[in-house]
């Protein structure tokens, strides 16, 4: 099999990403400088290992997390980190020309750095539905679409919600899913005769996932702490989201094993179901009063992420073409709302608590925020979907999906690759 | 006990600079986050800047973003905000505050504690 | 921007009044409210936090009710150093901290 890109490709990548990539270093260069107030240094240090384990994450843990697949692990760590480089950029100029762009120039800090990483990692969840599917100049498109969307989000909701910075950005989970689903939903779907073998996880790689998943589990309290305002919060967060992600991967072993008519535990699900806790208290881990509940929300999104990955991998096949090993996708949106449902709660004693006759307006305020979250993702989502299906891009023919070979130059081009 | 001492005010030409600098002590500073509020001669008091406790976000006011930065130094407890482009209608005096965060239900709450005596700034041709 | 406005603008009173002030909201805001003093030529002291949370140090005269939008601070009984001016202050937006714009409390 031929290991060179379509010459279509070849023209068209490298001069839709080199354009794209000069124009953002010219919109650098006219509308932004570094914040010159630094005089702490060693605040400094201190604020950029939070901004460090955010890019660990992102590289490192989605990088490999979606690396399973036996002949696409290469394309999806690789890609993974260009979408990633990508985001980053044009995210911290979006929240830039979004937050401050009427006072002139936008000031870059390492805050608005940290934003950036986690607008690009919603990217990098999203694509975990499409990854095999599409190549690079496709990827492209979907990283400016989601970022750009996600971006108005935040900026939205933190106009009519009032929400901070932790509320507004801990959407991502809910938002990356749908934005995924939907993509993938306006994709080709079929895998043509004899490709089946290629959306199969092989055993080196998953080793790589699970390294991925490590990463990811180690890193998750910085994540859901990395925009909180007070050390009281940060501390909140960080232990919650630790308590939570600990009872999860207990939970997602044995209930793998209990799933299972041999009492065999799935490599697939417990890459993800690792996770489940930090994503299921990510809104609300700075609120959560103490352990024993963070703990109970990790049992109960480990065990929830467990059964979709069962039940959900058919369905999510048949109708949106994704394969059974990319269970981010549905596993982050059902654990998304779990989140949202959580906070919800917390929100309702909060107004009881003070007295307030106004539950249901504040309820209300908060499902409305879910839902604009989740029309946003969907229909930004579908846009993208139908912009990657446009020739020009020259989408990856069915039978070359999933396929390392179509993007990377091997020298000893191993059959079985 | 807590003390914060703001310096730095004084009378400026209009558009021309001006660094103000908040002391404090009594407490662990970096462990706060800060805040700058002013209030005009005769009126009532309006919030301008906050920076985190490390220091790693700030957000101001919209009538200063772009003109006004929030800085601070934890290894010596200082505070300090950089005014440029500086405006008639920015004749205030100048109070720091320290930011206390308390747990609620959906979100936290926050509320400044303590304040220093303030520091008149004029701007005037 | 969340707006808060205080009424009334300015009252007198006498030593030993039952003082009411209120602060509404532009919208709901909770608990989510503070309560200042602040003398003439002097800084601003918190009251109370959290709506009705009395501040530590702060006489038990003082009292603050109320949630959603409409907030009410309490003078039981008027003392002499009271008089002055009376700042409410949300920090449901967190990303702009604002003020009403003040009740000054005179001597009748």
């Known amino acids: 099999m031929s290991s060179k890109y379509p010459r279509s490709v070849r023209r068209c990548l490298p001069l839709w990403a080199l354009t794209l990539e000069a124009a953002l270093i010219l919109l650098f260069y006219f509308f932004t400088h570094y914040d010159a107030s630094l005089e702490d240094q060693k605040g400094l240090v201190a604020s950029y290992q939070v901004g460090q384990d955010l890019t660990v994450m992102a590289a490192i843990g989605l990088g490999f997390l979606t690396s399973s697949f036996r002949r696409h692990s290469w394309s999806s760590v690789a890609f993974n980190l260009f979408m990633l480089a990508l985001g980053v950029q044009w995210a911290i100029l979006l929240d830039g020309f979004l937050s401050q762009f009427p006072s002139g120039k936008v000031v870059i800090t390492l805050f608005s750095i940290r934003l950036a990483t986690m607008s690009a990692l919603s990217v990098l969840i999203s694509v975990d539905a499409v990854l095999g599917k599409v190549n690079l100049a496709q990827l492209v498109v979907m990283v400016l679409v989601e970022v750009t969307a996600l971006g108005n989000l935040r900026m939205v909701i933190s106009n009519i919600f009032n929400t901070d910075y932790h509320m507004n950005m801990m959407h991502i989970y809910v938002f990356a899913a749908y934005f995924g689903l939907s993509v993938a939903w306006c994709l080709p779907k079929p895998l043509p005769e004899g490709t089946e073998d290629k959306d199969q996880t092989a055993t080196i790689p998953s080793l790589s996932a699970m390294l991925g998943a490590l990463f990811l589990w180690m890193f998750w309290p910085s994540f859901n702490s990395a925009l909180l305002r007070s050390p009281i919060e940060r501390k909140n967060a960080v232990f919650n989201t630790y308590y939570a992600v600990a009872v999860s991967v207990v939970t997602a072993i044995s209930g793998s094993s209990l799933a299972h008519p041999q009492g065999k535990i799935s490599k697939t699900y417990v890459h993800s179901a690792v996770l489940a806790g930090g994503v299921a208290v990510g809104t609300s881990c700075h609120l959560i009063p103490s352990p024993w509940l963070a703990m109970v929300l990790g049992l109960v999104a480990g065990l929830i992420s467990v059964g979709g990955a069962k039940y959900l991998p058919g369905c999510c096949n048949r109708v949106l073409g994704i394969p059974h090993s990319s269970i981010m996708g549905y596993n982050f949106s059902l654990l998304g709302l779990l989140g949202e449902i959580i906070y919800i709660v917390l929100l309702v004693l909060d107004t009881v608590g003070a007295g307030n006759g106004m539950i249901g307006f504040q309820v209300l305020l908060s499902i409305g925020e879910l839902s604009l979250a989740i029309v946003i993702a969907l229909m930004s989502g579908l846009l993208t979907g139908l912009l990657l299906n446009l020739k020009i891009w020259k989408a990856p023919h069915e039978a070359k999906y999933f396929d390392d070979q179509v993007f990377w130059k091997f020298p000893h081009l191993a059959v079985g690759f | 006990q807590v003390q914060l001492v703001e310096s730095g005010g004084g009378v400026v030409q209009p558009g021309r600079s001006l660094r103000l600098s908040c002391a404090a002590s009594g407490f662990t500073f970096r462990t706060y986050g800060m805040h700058w509020v002013r209030q005009a001669p005769g009126k009532g008091l309006e919030w301008v800047a906050v920076i985190w406790y490390d220091g790693s976000n700030k957000d101001y006011a919209d009538s200063v973003k772009g003109r006004f930065t929030i800085s601070r130094d934890n290894s010596k407890n200082t505070l300090h905000l950089q005014m440029n482009s500086l405006r008639a209608e920015d004749t205030a005096v100048y109070y720091c505050?320290?930011?206390?965060?308390?747990?609620?239900?959906?979100?936290?709450?926050?509320?400044?504690?303590?304040w220093g005596q303030g520091t008149l700034v004029t701007v005037s041709s | 921007d969340i707006q808060l406005t205080q009424s009334p603008s300015s009252l007198s009173a006498s030593v030993g009044d039952r003082v009411t002030i209120t602060c509404r909201a532009s919208?709901?805001?909770?608990?989510?409210l503070n309560w200042y003093q602040q003398n003439p030529g002097k800084a601003p002291k918190l009251l109370i936090y959290g709506a009705s949370n009395l501040q530590s140090g702060v006489p038990s005269r003082f009292s603050g009710s109320g949630s959603g939008t409409d907030f009410t601070l309490t003078i039981s009984s008027l003392q002499p150093e009271d008089f002055a001016t009376y700042y409410c202050?949300?920090?449901?937006?967190?990303?702009?901290?604002?003020f009403g714009g003040g009740t000054k409390v005179e001597i009748k």
């Open positions: 505050a320290r930011e206390i965060a308390s747990r609620g239900y959906s979100r936290y709450l926050y509320y400044l504690d303590f």
């Open positions: 919208q709901s805001i909770s608990s989510y």
């Open positions: 202050q949300q920090s449901y937006s967190t990303l702009a901290l604002t």
